[in-house]
Interface confidence: low
């Protein structure tokens, strides 16, 4: 709330000169007035345009006491209309009004640009009463003015539900130019035109703009703000700024770096994260992007094998994440891997090549000539097969996996057996009589389990019957 400092009634003469508490700035001068009858203003500031007609609201008070004497209209006295000052200076301005003593407890409020100024503002109201009227001076002070203090200030007083409004006091805070738009850093294509924008405001206006490139002025004649600088093109990095000038002085914008887009630097630190028989997971650290965002990357893979034709496999991938799983590789093979990335300008050189290997694969063929016999005397099933013809990449044979499924009267049960790589026969115990036994065999290497052979079925009768099943896959060359 606005603080009020009421003073005791003091026998001030009506026009002795400036009243205590009235404050002057460079823009105001107190007028000495002849002593005239009626309610002549006790205090008056010279308006910006002397003699201009008064435009404030007027309240016409009436007194209904004996004699029905009519009081003259109430109005704020003219004051300075326009205060111009520099940023960070202090300012104090006031409005004054003489109010007949019939009106008690009037309050004055300050408003700026249509909004009431509440709270921690330096507003003081002083009262100078005499017999018939009280001169009221409302002062408003701002320390270290800022641009945000610019605006139109008025006083308002409420009497008998009528509002009396003063003439506005325009505060204009002048200072160095203030940037509303500064040039922005850019990444541009070599020898391609681009624009930079600079805008600054006062007051005071006008604001003139000079452009600076690498510490040298670009334009000899200033341009009125706002200014757009068209640069026809650059071949190397440059730093631009703009200077804004007004009557108060000069403000320099931030310097912005204009970079020339170039092809990226090659990726670095290509790393192997994981290898399987047919894939390798790699990552890399992207090189400098050449001031243009990466678009995509290319993973280049060469088989390191004297017998290979030296062809390069190329896998395109997004630039992020900096990781790629290379698939469709041969098992147990050596590869040389490089990465290159591109931006809008072009492709980087390839990263340093790194060596990587795939692991053993699983066998690709099943054991051959699988035959199954029932050995009734021992109550077991004999199984025989031929070693599959595996490729080197499948790795070393470590054994076989035998699947035997027993089916009887709607019940099915699968069992698995593992045998060593030197075996080409196995015996399994009969699990159920009067049932079908289906046998399949797969070769196993460190790389995994290969495909199972075609199923071979044998019927296990009740005791006293013998059955024999043929081989599942004929040996090569057999009809």
């Amino acid at each position: 709330a606005i603080t009020e400092a009421r003073e005791e009634a003091k026998p001030y003469p009506l026009f002795p000169g400036p009243l205590p508490g009235s404050l002057q700035t460079d823009h105001t001068s107190l007028l000495s007035l002849p002593h005239t009858s009626g309610y002549q203003p006790a205090l008056m500031f010279s308006p910006t345009q002397p003699g201009r007609p008064y435009t404030g609201n007027v309240a016409i008070p009436r007194v209904t006491s004996a004699g029905s004497k009519l009081l003259p209209p109430l109005a704020f006295k003219h004051t300075v209309g326009h205060i111009i000052l520099s940023e960070h200076k202090d300012v104090k301005f006031n409005c004054s009004i003489s109010v007949p003593n019939i009106y008690q407890d009037t309050t004055i409020s300050w408003w700026k640009d249509g909004k009431e100024l509440l709270g921690a503002h330096h507003a003081i109201t002083q009262f100078y009463p005499d017999d018939e009227v009280t001169a009221i001076i409302a002062s408003f002070s701002i320390t270290s003015v800022q641009r945000s203090d610019n605006g139109s200030y008025i006083c308002k007083m409420k009497i008998n539900n009528e509002e009396i409004v003063s003439d506005p006091i325009y505060i204009e805070v002048q200072g160095l130019p203030h940037f509303t738009k500064q040039p922005e850093s850019m990444n541009v294509t070599r020898n391609t035109a681009f624009n930079l924008t600079c805008q600054a405001v006062g007051p005071p206006e006008p604001v003139n703009i000079f452009w600076v490139q690498n510490s040298s002025r670009v334009n000899e004649q200033p341009e009125k703000s706002p200014s757009v600088l068209t640069v026809p093109g650059l071949t190397e990095m440059a730093v631009f700024s703009c200077e804004a000038h007004n009557d108060k002085g000069l403000t320099v914008s931030k310097g912005v770096q204009i970079n020339i887009k170039a092809i990226p630097s090659p990726p670095t630190e290509v790393s192997i994260h994981n290898s399987t028989a047919h894939s390798i997971l790699i990552s890399w650290v992207p090189g400098f992007d050449g001031y243009s965002p990466f678009r995509n990357c290319s993973v280049q893979v060469k088989e390191v094998d004297p017998l290979s034709n030296g062809s390069v496999m190329i896998f395109n991938t997004s630039a992020s994440p900096h990781m790629y799983q290379i698939k469709q590789l041969q098992a147990l093979a050596n590869y040389s891997i490089g990465v290159s990335c591109m931006n809008e300008i072009g492709w980087s050189a390839v990263s340093p090549w790194i060596l990587a290997s795939t692991t053993e694969g699983a066998p690709s063929v099943a054991p051959l000539n699988v035959t199954v016999f029932l050995n009734e005397s021992r109550d077991n099933v004999d199984i025989r097969w031929m070693k599959p013809l595996t490729k080197r990449q499948a790795g070393e044979l470590v054994g076989y996996r035998i699947s035997h499924v027993w089916q009887s009267a709607g019940i099915s049960k699968e069992l698995l057996e593992e045998v060593g790589q030197n075996n080409s026969r196995a015996q399994i115990s009969v699990q159920v009589h009067n049932a079908t036994c289906t046998v399949r065999i797969a070769a196993v290497t460190k790389g995994g389990v290969g495909p199972f052979s075609d199923p071979v079925k044998i019927f296990i009768p009740a005791h006293g019957w013998v059955d024999h099943a043929p081989s599942s896959t004929p040996a090569p060359g057999n009809a």
Epitope: N187, V239, Q257, S265, T268, F288, D289, Y291
Partner: antibody
Framework: QIQLVQSGPELKKPGETVKISCKAS????????MSWVKQAPGKGLQWMGW????????TYTDDFKGRFAFSLEASASTAFLQINNLKNEDTSTYFC???????????????WGTGTTVTVSS | DIQMTQSPSSLFASLGGKVIITCKSS??????ISWYQHKPGKGPRLLIH???SLQPGIPLRFSGSGSGRDYSFSISNLEPEDIATYFC????????FGAGTKLELK
């Protein structure tokens, strides 16, 4: 191999000046900004600011404005931290650290120096 | 400024075991957090950035997760060379570090 090698320990008196160095190798020095980080004994790490290794423009955090100065000798791929008018509370280990992103709004440190211990004692 | 609260300040663990360290930020840091390992006499080493992205060459035993204001870092199958101090760094708004967690053997 990317590395940042810092100068050796320093013993100074209050009021004196110290200048410590951070020599980079294994990468393009002027492509990655260089930061400085302070670790006082028994305290956590404090980011002091960074220097643009291309333009040489330093940026200081609020706590390190005034007595601290970052500089470069780009031809030698070396960054420097100078502390003027040393105080007892400057006794710390100072690390240089490379910012990970070359051109990015958000960045962290991917390579650090081994640290330089500065002791200020009368 | 954003504050980073790291816990615990020290931790005793067994070889082969798992440890979890957390960092809580004073406001949402949009997953912009990195984790470092620091051994005496050496410079800190970047392990993880962007909450969970493992730096090349860092073993898969190290991992990170989190979002918003809560982030965690873990080491599984602890090895002797993992004994060090670990700290986090937020880089969403300026840069602030966690106070660090000293990892020791039980």
């Amino acid at each position: 191999q990317i590395q940042l090698v810092q100068s050796g320990p320093e013993l100074k008196k209050p009021g004196e000046t110290v200048k410590i160095s951070c020599k980079a190798s294994g990468y393009t020095f002027t492509a990655y900004g260089m930061s400085w980080v302070k670790q006082a004994p028994g305290k956590g790490l404090q980011w002091m600011g960074w220097i643009n290794t291309y333009s040489g423009v330093p940026t200081y955090t609020d706590d390190f404005k005034g007595r601290f100065a970052f500089s470069l000798e780009a031809s030698a791929s070396t960054a420097f931290l100078q502390i003027n008018n040393l105080k007892n509370e400057d006794t710390s280990t100072y690390f240089c650290a490379r910012r990970a992103a070359v051109v990015a709004k958000y960045w962290y440190f991917d390579v650090w120096g081994t640290g330089t211990t500065v002791t200020v004692s009368s | 400024d954003i504050q980073m609260t790291q816990s615990p300040s020290s931790l005793f663990a067994s070889l082969g075991g798992k440890v979890i360290i957390t960092c809580k930020s004073s406001q949402d840091i949009n997953k912009r957090i990195s984790w470092y390992q620091h051994k005496p006499g050496k410079g800190p080493r970047l392990l993880i950035h962007s909450t969970s992205s493992l730096q090349p060459g860092i073993p898969l035993r190290f991992s990170g997760s989190g979002s918003g204001r809560d982030y965690s870092f873990s080491i599984s199958n602890l090895e002797p060379e993992d004994i060090a101090t670990y700290f986090c760094l937020q880089y969403d708004n300026l840069l602030t570090f966690g106070a660090g967690t000293k990892l020791e053997l039980k």
